[in-house]
């Protein structure tokens, strides 16, 4: 049977804090555990998820976690299912809310001597206790003229008088925490002797040298005073005007008129009303000078026929906000139809070729007017002027393939060779008109070429096959100087290609015929056994009917290939002694000898006093040092062949003789001693 070792239990939890409902199960076989909330399976989220068999809450939520949780363990094999005890959270929370007018129904109904009730919309569990404030000062329950009902969260003022005017706020606290009102209530109960606003001045935007009017009226018993001030607190009256407000007039009803407005008149104007009692009322309004900036440039636009496109006109910065309209051919666009204006956008629906042209965006306000043109091109699908033709191009010469098309805007042409895009390089060039030039035609250029001409409206393509007319040429050209080994068999190849397979023959440069032991077999000159007389100049001639003949001259040298008479041996030398590395080579022409030591050629002219290369090829190194150790290579070469042989040189410390060693004891390796 399935047994719960740990069962979930109901518990207090704090809104937004961690919590854990424990569940641990013991069963004969494997089981899977899941949780129910009010009978429905609980799905894991980042906030609430299974942790082993328990249910973990990263942040308790009073709405999503209210209800009954139950842990269910199921053995899927047997179908046995066990359910834990139910558990729920007692979630403690507090949530801020506004201060609202409960009585009377609207602010307009508040009169002196009426009862006013405000409600604090802070809620929570457990129910919090409330504290009221006016203008930040706490209101205690026992004070005159107001009562606080904590149960209804209400503050009642009876009767309400001007002295109750102010900003009302509330705070509440509970075991969970504290919260204060998210929005406060301003109670304003008029005193007849206090100045009250009848007409407030409004911000004004005017063009330079135009006139501006600000209206301002207050009421009170007895009537209040009214004064106008400009930014720098200078009073404006009909008797004393500041120098920069010479054209200002204050009317009996409180209105202020400014004529021929200039930039220096822009700024904040204050209208101040003062009743017999109470604070002065200061009303502000700003005079702005109208302005309009330049419009940004439009990029030319390319559209395709049949599509719908929009061009947005960004109005220039300006005051007041400039109005925007579009014109085409001097006519303002309508707000509906196929080509019309929508907001600041020019809309072209189902575009026709005839829609191409210049469209103008206008922007205007009190400060003036601005305009900007946009050039609209309606793209057309390219049409052929000249398609690429199947062509025969000569090898080694430039070749051209045409791809001439016309469209609006000018079409772009790309070429493909064997379905691969041709990128322009030293061999390929695409001219402005679309023609492809192959700078030096090669045999493998014989293939399919395709050109594609495109505009935003569409593309056309055509292909052509190129056949390369091969030039008559040696493949590869024979080496002009070649060596043959004396008394050995030798071959000298010569092959050529052309439009037609060429015939190939060899002859001696002096015109004499080839000896009988020398054969010419399909272009390969074969010497059965090379003699000294075979040396000389030979010519390979390749010819065919259409292309004539070509010649290649070869100078054959008969040589005795190099052999070493003496080779250097592995040598060990005491430090400070002299090393001799012998090397002698023979061959015809007589070989020259070079030495390579420590991976660099030893230049006889730059050897220094310690090293010397003898006429016979041997290398001597005096006063050897450990750094002279290494491999030394003797290289023998002549005009026909090169051969090398190498040996290591070891430089060792001279041993101190021990008494046990007789004077005749040989060293354990071959030594050169001097």
């Amino acid at each position: 049977a399935i047994v719960f070792i740990k069962q979930p239990s109901s518990q207090d939890a704090l809104q937004g804090r961690r919590a854990l409902l424990r569940c641990e199960v013991e069963a004969p076989g494997p089981v899977h555990v899941y949780w129910l909330l009010d009978g429905a399976p609980v799905q894991d989220t980042e906030r609430r998820f299974a942790q082993g068999s328990s249910l973990s809450f990263a942040a308790v939520d009073r709405l999503q976690d209210s209800g009954t949780f139950q842990c269910v363990a199921r053995d899927d094999v047997t179908g046995e299912e066990a359910r834990s005890a139910n558990a729920s959270f007692n979630i403690k929370w507090i949530e801020a809310g506004p201060v609202v007018l409960k009585h009377p129904a609207s602010e307009a109904e508040i009169q002196p001597q009426t009862q006013v009730t405000l409600r604090c919309h802070i809620d929570g569990h457990p129910r919090p206790t409330y504290q009221w404030f006016r203008d930040g000062t706490p209101l205690s329950d026992g004070q005159s003229n107001h009562t606080v009902s904590s149960k209804e969260r209400n503050l009642t003022l009876r009767p309400a008088g001007p002295e109750h005017s102010g900003l009302y706020s509330c705070c509440a606290h509970s075991a969970f925490g504290q919260a204060c009102s998210s929005q406060n209530f301003t109670l304003s109960i008029a005193d007849e002797s206090f100045a009250r606003v009848v007409l407030a001045p409004q911000d004004v935007v005017v063009a330079r040298y135009e006139e501006a009017m600000f209206h301002c009226q207050f009421s009170a018993q007895p009537p209040p005073s009214l004064q106008w001030l400009f930014e720098d607190e200078t009073p404006i009256t009909n008797r004393s005007r500041p120098p920069h407000l010479r054209r200002a007039t204050v009317f009996a009803n409180g209105s202020l008129l400014l004529t021929q407005v200039r930039p220096r008149n822009a700024g904040i104007y204050r209208c101040i009303g003062q009743g017999q009692r109470g604070p002065p009322i200061i009303l502000e309004a700003t005079l702005h000078l109208a302005e309009i900036e330049d419009m940004p440039l439009f990029e030319p636009r390319v559209f395709t026929a049949g599509s719908e496109e929009r061009v947005t006109c960004l109005p220039p910065k300006g005051l007041p906000e400039p109005s925007v309209w579009w014109e085409h051919a001097g006519v303002r666009l309508p707000t509906h139809g196929r080509v019309y204006q929508k907001g600041h956008e020019l809309v072209l629906a189902n575009i026709a070729e005839s829609d191409a042209g210049v469209y103008t965006c206008h922007a205007a306000n009190l400060a003036g007017q601005r305009r900007q043109d946009v050039n609209i091109t309606v793209a057309t699908v390219p049409s052929w002027l000249k398609k690429p033709q199947d062509s025969q191009l000569e090898e080694g010469k430039p070749g051209y393939l045409d791809c001439l098309t016309q469209a609006t805007p000018k079409p772009t042409v790309v070429w493909y060779r064997n379905q691969m895009l041709i990128s322009e390089d030293s061999r390929f060039e695409v001219f402005k008109n679309g023609t492809l030039r192959i700078n030096s035609v090669e045999v493998y250029d014989g293939t399919w070429y395709r050109c594609m001409s495109s505009t935003p409206a569409g593309s056309i393509e055509a292909q052509a096959r190129v056949q390369v007319l091969e030039k008559l040429k040696f493949t590869p050209p024979p080496q002009p100087q070649q060596c043959m080994e004396f008394d050995k068999e030798a071959t000298v190849p010569c092959s050529a290609t052309g439009r037609e397979k060429p015939t190939i023959k060899w002859e001696r440069a002096d015109g004499s015929s080839l000896p009988e032991w020398v054969t010419d077999n399909a272009g390969t000159l074969h010497f059965a056994r090379v003699t000294r007389d075979d040396a000389g100049n030979y010519t390979c001639i390749a010819s065919n009917g259409p292309q004539g003949q070509i010649r290649a001259h070869v100078q054959l040298t008969v040589a005795v290939f190099i052999t070493f008479k003496v080779e250097p041996e592995r040598t060990t030398v005491y430090q400070g002694h002299t090393a001799l590395l012998q090397c002698e080579a023979q061959g015809d022409p007589k070989p020259l000898i070079q030495w390579k030591g420590k991976d660099r050629i030893l230049d006889p002219t730059k050897l220094g006093p310690r090293m010397h290369i003898f006429q016979n090829g041997s290398l001597v190194i005096h006063d050897v040092a450990p750094e002279d150790s290494g491999r030394y290579t003797c290289i023998a070469g002549n005009s026909c062949n090169i051969k090398h042989t190498e040996a290591p040189l070891y430089v060792v410390d001279k041993p101190v003789p021990e008494e046990s060693e007789g004077p005749g004891s040989p060293p354990p390796y071959k030594m050169i001693q001097t």
């Epitope: 899977h32 899941y34 399976p41 269910v72 199921r74 899927d76 047997t78 046995e80």
Partner: antibody, heavy 112, light 110 residues
Framework: EVQLVESGGGLVQPGGSLRLSCTAS????????MNWVRQAPGKGLEWVGI???????YYASWAKGRFTISRDTSKNTVYLQMNSLRAEDTAVYFC??????WGQGTLVTVSS | EIVMTQSPSTLSASVGDRVIITCQSS????????LAWYQQKPGKAPKLLIY???NLASGVPSRFSGSGSGAEFTLTISSLQPDDFATYYC??????????FGQGTKLTVL
């Protein structure tokens, strides 16, 4: 001996209703989950729904609305009520306790 | 809607062969391991082979094994025996007490 026996299958006309029973012996339904699974002739297994140990039911999306699983713990029997039957509901209907214990199945044929 | 896809749908093999059947689910199974494999022979109720992805059911030979996690699972028969030619089904369990079967793999003699 622990076993399950299905009954109530038979021929029914399209649009008709049928109630299948699955009687359990050797164990009490109130501690176990019971599945209904069906298999159309020559086709694969298709899960219909489940009733858990508390009597809550869950269904395959295609079965919701037409099929209802219930139980009577006093009779130790699980039921499958099938309404608005169609030709494609023709199948052998199995009841199963968990994954291991299956009944022999009962054939339902929907045909006019 | 949950879809479980078994592959291959049919499989021909010989006695002694190693056979692998895969089961892919359109969403992860519960706890990444709530998956079972059944064997069914014609006219019989399905027989449980593997439960919780890799556990061998009572009386099932050890040549059967299961593996996988999340949404991809495999059933392996290490050395096919004559009695193993049958149809095999995978079954997954999902959040919200929802279950689903694969379409089945029919294993026949080559």
């Amino acid at each position: 001996e622990v076993q399950l026996v299905e009954s109530g299958g038979g021929l029914v006309q399209p649009g008709g209703s049928l109630r299948l029973s699955c009687t359990a012996s050797g164990f009490s339904l109130s501690n176990y989950v019971m599945n209904w699974v069906r298999q159309a002739p020559g086709k694969g297994l298709e899960w219909v729904g489940i009733i858990d140990s508390s009597g809550s039911t869950y269904y395959a999306s295609w079965a919701k609305g037409r099929f209802t699983i219930s139980r009577d713990t006093s009779k130790n029997t699980v039921y499958l009520q099938m309404n608005s039957l169609r030709a494609e509901d023709t199948a052998v209907y199995f009841c199963a306790r968990g994954l291991y214990l299956w009944g022999q199945g009962t054939l339902v044929t929907v045909s006019s | 809607e949950i879809v479980m896809t078994q592959s291959p749908s049919t499989l021909s093999a010989s006695v002694g062969d190693r056979v692998i059947i895969t089961c892919q689910s359109s969403q992860s199974v519960y706890n990444n391991n709530l998956l079972a494999w059944y064997q069914q022979k014609p006219g019989k109720a399905p027989k449980l082979l593997i439960y919780y992805t890799s556990n061998l059911a009572s009386g099932v030979p050890s040549r059967f094994s299961g593996s996988g996690s999340g949404a991809e699972f495999t059933l392996t028969i290490s050395s096919l025996q004559p009695d193993d030619f049958a149809t095999y089904y995978c079954q997954g369990g999902y959040h919200g007490n929802i279950y689903a079967f694969g379409q089945g793999t029919k294993l026949t003699v080559l």
